[in-house]
């Protein structure tokens, strides 16, 4: 007695989509046999505009396959993301974005320099677009540092006015009494810690103006304060030792020839800070006629020796130890020419010689009760004392 | 069995950011396919955002392409939707959403009420 | 791509034999899904690639169409279909229909 199997219908061949090939190849496909679809590199499996990792189809007993063949389609990375203050150029052709074509990523000539790579990046066959390092994200196009219109580091108080594009860096911080600041990258500013203290738990109150030359103009960009961090060695109103603090800005600021970032100083900067090198201050403190200056002023100064500082304010009414290893010390033994009350939290500002950009070595902080006293000299954060600490800000915030 | 589970805040204020996460359960988000979102309006029209692919490659609607941002975090089998600038006409359900034919199938999360109110 | 389904309502009895059109304003091969969803649920898949049923879905549920012009038919309505349904293509992004609602005579 034999019973008559119907031998279940043969699914319909399949056919390989295009740049696609099909395993396991078999003369035929009967009821539960199977089989994948691979893609060439630089193509992707696509059910329309969906995406696969992998298919699989499988023969039903009705002679059909369980699902519709796939696409391989040519990988798309899909528009590159834009780049602040820089532009993409499609190198393969007009809008070209799929597998293998390749982009050009720039930055705005003279203020900004691109960070991380060459800036050319290929559509990879993992959908992405990736740098000849192998890095997803786009660069970064980093503001250009320590440019000024000054070119000179020759010849506030006992100080000349400042021209437009000299101190691209300055920054007017109001909210509390007058103080100054120095911008850095593009979204943070230098300052003394003791010019903001009061405000460092409400830093939203800080009034913050760049690219200003009078401190009165009304021509300026305003900025405003994200957060404030003040040093955690700085102690107030018990010496001015870290003396310095870092504001975070609520926007990043567009870099132009009147805002420019200040460069941090490098590991050889101290070659450039030595006895007698030059500094320049700049702010809108106290002048010689005891009034805050309407127009921005500079002065340059000499550095001087830490030794002869340190003796200038062990006597009376100073006491012993004020100036610390975390100070440097500039002015003329004759006075005259210093900064003064106002200009704190601003930077002194030395040439590197090497790089021809200017640097931050000081920042405003504290001086005689009387500004350009004789054998008295402003005393200033030694900001190299401070890398470390201000990039782990920058870094995590 | 694969399971989305939508979370978020109820309410939105006008001009603030939108933020989503659908939590996956029984299946790894990089295994495969498109985990995407689709909003409904009051008066039951559905809107496709977006999705990020098993690879982490992002679509988006072009409609709404300047302003949305879809992420994951691969350890905790989590997809994201940010939506910046929300105004009122953005009040709808939001799902989360497993797209795909075949063996694929289909998974939806229940949804999650978004009001856009100052 | 607009996904067009014309009629917003449609009424129908138990046991009756019922189409819901869908018409694309372009070319979108079979990439077509169809969903049901009833008040207060997620939406639920039905049909995926124009005419593939999902597993667990009542074979009286069955798609067609290819191109620009599809259709969702209910060949023995049974009370439980009462719901609104959308089609969905995703041959170029991803959009939906705006709905058809069935409901009784």
């Known amino acids: 007695h034999h019973h008559h199997h119907h031998a279940s219908q043969p699914c319909p061949y399949p056919m390989a989509p295009p740049n696609g090939h099909l395993s396991p190849v078999q003369a035929k496909y009967i009821l539960k046999d199977s089989f994948s679809i691979f893609c060439e590199p630089g193509y992707e499996l696509l059910q329309g505009h969906l995406p696969l990792k992998s298919f699989a189809a499988v023969c039903q007993k009705d002679g059909s396959w369980d699902q519709p063949m796939p696409s391989c389609s040519i990988v798309d990375c899909g528009p590159p993301d834009d780049l602040p203050s820089g532009r993409v150029e499609y190198i393969t052709g007009p809008e070209v974005t799929t597998y293998k074509a390749v982009i050009q990523y720039s930055c705005e000539e003279t203020f900004y320099t691109m960070k991380v790579n060459d800036g050319k990046y290929v559509c990879e066959a993992d959908g992405f677009w990736t740098s000849s390092k192998g890095e997803r994200s786009p660069p970064v196009c980093e503001p250009v540092c320590g440019l000024s219109a000054r070119t000179t580091g020759g010849r506030i108080y006992g100080g000349q006015k400042a021209k437009p594009g000299d101190f691209p860096w300055q920054v007017l911080i109001l909210g509390g009494s007058t103080a100054a600041g120095a911008l850095l990258y593009d979204n943070w500013v230098l300052t003394a810690a003791h010019a903001i203290y009061e405000q460092k738990h409400d830093a939203s109150s800080l009034d913050i103006r760049l690219g200003a030359l009078k401190r009165l103009s009304p021509h300026y960009t305003q900025a405003w304060a994200e957060a404030v961090f003040i040093h955690e060695g700085y102690t107030h109103d018990a010496g001015f030792d870290n003396d310095i603090a870092l504001i975070k800005l609520n926007n990043k600021v567009v870099i132009n020839s009147n805002i420019t970032p200040i460069c941090l100083p490098r590991k050889e900067a101290e070659s450039f800070m030595r006895t007698d090198d030059i500094g320049t201050a700049s702010g809108w403190g106290l002048t010689q006629r005891g009034l805050l200056a309407r127009n921005l002023m500079y002065v340059d100064i000499p550095i001087v020796d830490h030794q002869k500082c340190t003796a200038a304010y062990e006597k009376p009414p100073y006491s012993g130890g004020s100036v610390t290893a975390n100070m440097l010390c500039a002015g003329l033994e004759s006075g005259g020419k210093d900064s003064c009350r106002g200009d704190a939290g601003g930077a002194l500002v030395f040439l590197d010689n090497e790089t021809q950009r200017w640097f931050v070595g000081g920042i405003v902080s504290w001086g005689s009760m009387n500004c350009g006293e004789a054998g008295q000299y402003g005393v200033y954060t030694k900001v190299i004392n401070y890398i470390p600490w201000i990039k782990n800000i920058i870094s995590n915030f | 069995d694969v399971q989305l589970q939508e979370s978020g805040p109820g309410l939105v204020k006008p001009s603030q950011s939108l933020s989503l996460t659908c939590t996956v359960t029984g299946y790894s988000i990089t295994s495969d396919y498109a985990w995407n979102w689709i909003r409904q309006f009051p008066g039951n029209k559905l809107e496709w955002m977006g999705y990020?692919?098993?690879?982490?490659?992002?679509s988006y609607n072009p409609s709404l392409k300047s302003r949305i941002s879809i992420t994951r975090d691969t350890s905790k089998n989590q997809f994201f939707l940010q939506l910046n600038s929300v105004t009122t006409e953005d009040t709808a359900t939001y799902y989360c959403a497993k797209l795909g034919g075949g063996h694929g199938m289909d998974y939806w999360g229940q949804g999650t009420s978004v009001t856009v109110s100052s | 791509i607009v996904m067009t389904q014309s009629q917003k309502f449609m009424s129908t009895s138990v046991g009756d034999r019922v189409s819901v059109t869908c018409k694309a304003s372009q070319n979108v091969d079979t990439n077509v899904a169809w969903y049901q969803q009833k008040p207060g649920q997620s939406p639920k898949a039905l049909i995926y690639?124009?005419?593939y049923r999902y597993s667990g879905v009542p074979d009286r549920f069955t798609g067609s169409g290819s191109g620009t012009d599809f259709t969702l038919t209910i060949s023995n309505v049974q009370s439980e279909d009462l719901a609104e349904y959308f089609c969905l293509q995703y041959n170029s992004y991803l959009t939906f229909g705006s709905g058809t609602k069935l409901e009784l005579k």
């Open positions: 990020i692919s098993y690879s982490g490659r992002t």
């Open positions: 690639s124009a005419s």
